[in-house]
């Protein structure tokens, strides 16, 4: 166990042009605050996948009006840190979410209103018990400095929090194979006792007496590896006669969440969905009210004037959940046309198209010739998937719009000269041939190859090809 | 702007019947993909049926072979057949499109929603 803890340095225009606009003004008041939204591991998860490790509020902050014609420099902020608790182990690698948000101060009907002014998100390694770690980060034309650490709550100690200390029992030294616990060196590690027997290959605790299995093995001391066949049964038999996986206790046995809310399975653990008034990872948190900005996203916040009557965000379109915090998943409509990757960002789709493919929906493709001009009298030819121009003479490129060398192929045989000219090419053909491309040779009788020379042309004479 | 009206919502026993149309109707240059979302209370809101950018139906497991999905292209309209409802299926159900409002803008509409209840 532990608490994770975010100190906001500042947060104003970035550098470089464009600086934003100050979100207050004399007419409209303003203050912020922030939220943090921390995820376990480094993968690019969604921003509305629960914040797994926690979520926090900050206070808020001082009201501030904008000066008129001041440049907008940095926002008053609130006191204080933000804390994310975590019960478990820490995990060393997370994701985070750091949101900015703007309460409006003046005269709207139904109380104040909150708007995102800005999301940055990051993945980072953090070792618990480090020290603070400092960071920079842009979103638009606002930059935010901050910084982190992660610390463990005795008598939780290492960097995951997973050793145990305790008081020494004698003066001078620890116990036999027990280290003192740095930096409370007054202290020494306690001896962490998973269940007689559990495997120390393919177990762990974090708790005194539990055995707890890595991915791939089962059993009361993850000694059986899982075989997700020849299973009798559904449930399969017994998972120490034959390695069948048994599902063992799911993560909503008992019911995890707090408060009445129900629970639900996901990949990788639980979510809450929490009844009004409360929210968080467990809906263990309560007496929220509007004044608390409780609702995310845009949402608006109605009722909840005092910590006893409950209050309801109003989510808009594409979030829900009973703080707005969580997406709808329009990607499983598969929007994207031709294979392209879908990408739900909240304010819009956006589709990552395969190559070939373009437009909003990957919509456009850019291997047909359906809307295709090939420049300067090309034509275009579809084959295998691709097109081409077949260009014009003279012309050459993807589009027929640069000028073709007529002579670069060398189209002139035995040894016949090319010469580029404005309707084509010219070849002179070497002594003995003749033609177009000095492709025929001339018989030494003087006949040619040829029915007949064209009129006005001798043999040897260069032929112009139109 | 594009609008979305759904409508033949309503109260019907378990094994019972219904069908929900959805008329998209507004500054339309072509529709992308449209189809059936449905949210419980307490749940999550989860796809139902759709059309897919492809043109592909889509289905959920769970009502696959009891709901069928269909369109009328000249209306721009998409249909829930909905038979065999069972209690589960109660929710309110949305119609979303995802509609080209021109040769390169496409946007994201809800509908209002239309309240289907399953009861003895």
């Known amino acids: 166990a532990g608490v994770f803890e975010l100190q906001i340095h500042s947060f104003g225009p970035g550098p470089g042009p464009g600086a934003p606009r100050s979100p207050c003004s004399a007419r409209l008041p303003c203050r912020l605050f922030f939220r943090v939204c921390l995820k376990p591991g480094l993968s690019e998860e969604a921003a509305e996948s629960p914040c797994a490790l926690g979520a926090a509020l900050s206070a808020r902050g001082p009201v501030y009006t904008e000066q008129p014609g001041a440049p907008a420099p940095d926002l008053p902020l609130p006191d204080g840190l933000l804390q994310v608790p975590f019960r478990d182990a820490w995990p060393g690698t997370f994701s985070f979410i750091i949101e900015t948000w703007r309460e409006e101060l003046g005269d709207q009907i139904g109380g104040p209103a909150w708007s995102l002014l800005a999301r940055v998100a990051g993945r980072r390694r953090l070792a618990a018990g480090g020290p603070w770690a400092r960071d920079i980060q842009r979103a638009g034309a606002w930059e935010l400095r901050f910084s982190y650490r992660a610390r463990c709550e005795p008598p939780a100690v290492g960097t995951a929090c997973t050793r145990l200390c305790r008081p020494r029992s004698a003066p001078s030294r620890c116990g036999p194979g027990l280290r003192p616990c740095a930096p409370l060196e007054d202290e020494c590690e306690a001896p962490l006792v998973c269940r007689a027997g559990c495997s120390p290959e393919h177990g762990f605790c974090e708790q005194p007496g539990e055995c707890r299995c890595l991915e791939g093995w089962t059993g009361p001391l993850c000694t059986v590896p899982v075989s997700t066949s020849s299973c009798l049964s559904p449930r399969g038999p017994s998972s120490a006669t034959t390695g069948c996986l048994v599902p063992g206790p799911g993560p909503c046995d008992g019911n995890p969440c707090a408060n009445g809310g129900s629970c639900s399975e996901t990949p990788r653990s639980f979510e809450c969905t929490c009844p009004r008034g409360f929210y968080g990872l467990r809906c263990e948190v309560s007496g929220v009210t509007c004044a608390d900005g409780p609702c995310f996203n845009g949402g608006l916040c109605v009722g909840g004037a005092d910590p006893d009557s409950a209050y309801i965000c109003h989510c808009p379109p594409g979030f829900q959940g009973s703080n707005c915090e969580k997406r709808v998943d329009r990607c499983s409509l598969q929007p994207c046309r031709n294979g392209g990757l879908c990408l739900d960002l909240g304010h819009a789709l956006r589709c990552r198209c395969r190559a070939g493919f373009a437009g909003p929906r990957c919509e456009h493709d850019l291997d047909d010739c359906a809307g295709r001009a090939c420049a300067n009298g090309g034509t275009c030819v579809e084959g295998g998937g691709a097109h081409r121009c077949s260009c014009a003479l003279g012309f050459g490129g993807r589009d027929c719009r640069e000028r073709a060398d007529p002579c670069a192929a060398r189209p002139c045989a035995h040894g016949g000269r090319c010469y580029a000219h404005f309707s084509g090419l010219v070849c002179a053909c070497a002594p003995g041939y003749m033609g177009a491309r000095c492709e025929f040779p001339v018989h030494p009788d003087g006949a040619s190859a040829l029915p007949a020379a064209p009129p006005g042309l001798r043999p040897g004479d260069p032929q112009r090809y139109l | 702007e594009v609008q979305l009206v759904e409508s033949g919502g309503g109260e019907v026993q378990p094994g019972g019947s219904l069908r929900l149309s959805c008329a998209a109707s507004g500054s339309i240059f072509s529709i992308n993909a449209m189809g059936w979302y449905r949210q419980a209370p307490g749940k999550q809101r989860e796809l139902v049926a759709g059309?897919?950018?492809?043109?592909?139906?889509k289905y959920a497991e769970s009502v696959k072979g009891r709901f069928t999905i269909s369109r009328d292209n000249a209306k721009n309209t998409v249909y829930l057949q909905m038979s065999s409802l069972r209690a589960e299926d109660t929710a309110v159900y949305y119609c979303?499109?995802?509609?080209?409002?021109?040769?390169?803008?496409?946007?994201?509409?809800w509908g209002q929603g239309t309240l289907v209840t399953v009861k003895p």
């Open positions: 059309f897919t950018g492809d043109g592909m139906t």
């Open positions: 979303a499109a995802d509609v080209f409002t021109d040769r390169d803008h496409v946007d994201w509409y």
